[in-house]
């Protein structure tokens, strides 16, 4: 189920690549965030907290990512036209409960000016 389009700027372009921003509520302590391209899982990141508040970050499908207290950024490089697609942030909240899954996303448009290695 798609809950809606992102209510923030999801795509940030720089240096022929794109940063895809996936937000989560900053109250959330344990979660899994997946980046989907269409229906395919491109990246995932799971944050858990153990005893003594030990934080563990795991990735089954690794992408260059960056975690903050309310977002996960996934980075895609060497953009070309094949990257144009719908991208979704699939968030599974584990703690604090209730368990909740939300899917938000948007369409990544690729313009010539954003491509990595344009022929001059």
């Amino acid at each position: 189920e798609i809950n809606g389009s992102a209510n923030y700027e999801m795509f940030i372009f720089h240096n022929g690549g794109v940063q895809i921003l996936c937000k989560y509520p900053d109250i959330v302590q344990q979660f899994k965030m997946q980046l989907l391209k269409g229906g395919q899982i491109l990246c995932d990141l799971t944050k858990t907290k153990g005893s003594g508040n030990t934080v563990s970050i795991k990735s089954l499908k690794f992408c260059h990512s960056q975690l903050s207290n309310n977002s996960v950024s996934f980075f895609l490089y060497n953009l070309d036209h094949s990257h144009a697609n719908y991208y979704f942030c699939n968030l599974s909240i584990f703690d604090p409960p209730p368990f909740k899954v939300t899917l938000t996303g948007g369409y990544l448009h690729i313009y010539e000016s954003q491509l990595c290695c344009q022929l001059k």
């Epitope: 109250i27 604090p96 939300t102």
Partner: antibody
Framework: QVQLVQSGAEVKKPGSSVKVSCKAS????????MHWVRQAPGQGLEWMGL????????NYNQKFQGRVTITADKSTSTAYMELSSLRSEDTAVYYC??????????????WGQGTTVTVSS | EIVLTQSPATLSLSPGERATLSCSAS?????MHWYQQKPGQAPRLLIY???KLASGIPARFSGSGSGTDFTLTISSLEPEDFAVYYC?????????FGQGTKLEIK
């Protein structure tokens, strides 16, 4: 139906502590986190903190850090909020509120009826 | 701390009129929630995620806005709508409420 029932009114002396209870029914207690919010007379609402029932993880408003302790007893489906070193400014109605999520944010979807705490010498 | 400023502090209207309540945040928030409180009662959730109607809330209530400016609208006031309304943000710690708008009968 989903209900949060809080303990009765308390009158406390400055410097003492108060422990307010919030008994949940109509849902699985460990499936939700619980927040505490207070409202001083004629004032607005103030978030105090929360507890994740299943992990016991707590998160407090820094304003109350060191004075507030939120706990939960899974066996009785009851959450507790204890406030120590009471002063007159702590006179307020204290509410528990159940945590829930929308697509983008979190909110309190069910509230207790409130517990009046009066701090007076 | 994100400060939420509600305006007006008091709004005097008659049943059947349209009410527009504002909530302004001192810095940008991702979403806003709205609560209604009647004397001697606990607050009740009206709107979550800026514009979504909570369960059991009549369709005359609606929410809108983004960034720092949010609005709660009641399209046609019913006698039971006269109460205090609070906005709430859970985007930035510590999580804060507005000071409230009292909606009273004119």
């Amino acid at each position: 139906q989903v209900q949060l029932v809080q303990s009765g009114a308390e009158v406390k002396k400055p410097g003492s502590s108060v422990k307010v209870s919030c008994k949940a029914s109509g849902y699985t207690f460990t499936d939700y986190a619980m927040h505490w919010v207070r409202q001083a007379p004629g004032q607005g609402l103030e978030w105090m903190g929360l507890i994740s029932i299943y992990s016991d993880h707590t998160n407090y408003n820094q304003k109350f850090q060191g004075r507030v302790t939120i706990t939960a007893d899974k066996s009785t489906s009851t959450a507790y909020m204890e406030l120590s070193s009471l002063r007159s400014e702590d006179t307020a109605v204290y509410y528990c509120g159940r945590n829930n999520y929308g697509n983008y944010g979190w909110y309190f979807d069910v509230w207790g009826q409130g517990t009046t705490v009066t701090v007076s010498s | 701390e994100i400060v939420l400023t509600q305006s007006p502090a008091t709004l005097s209207l008659s049943p059947g009129e349209r009410a527009t309540l504002s909530c302004s945040a001192s810095s940008s928030v991702s979403y806003m929630h709205w609560y209604q409180q009647k004397p001697g009662q606990a607050p009740r959730l009206l709107i979550y995620d800026t514009s979504k109607l909570a369960s059991g809330i009549p369709a005359r209530f609606s929410g809108s806005g983004s960034g720092t400016d949010f609005t709660l609208t009641i399209s046609s006031l019913e006698p039971e709508d006269f109460a205090v309304y609070y906005c709430f943000q859970g985007s930035g710690y510590p999580y804060t409420f507005g000071q409230g708008t009292k909606l009273e009968i004119k």
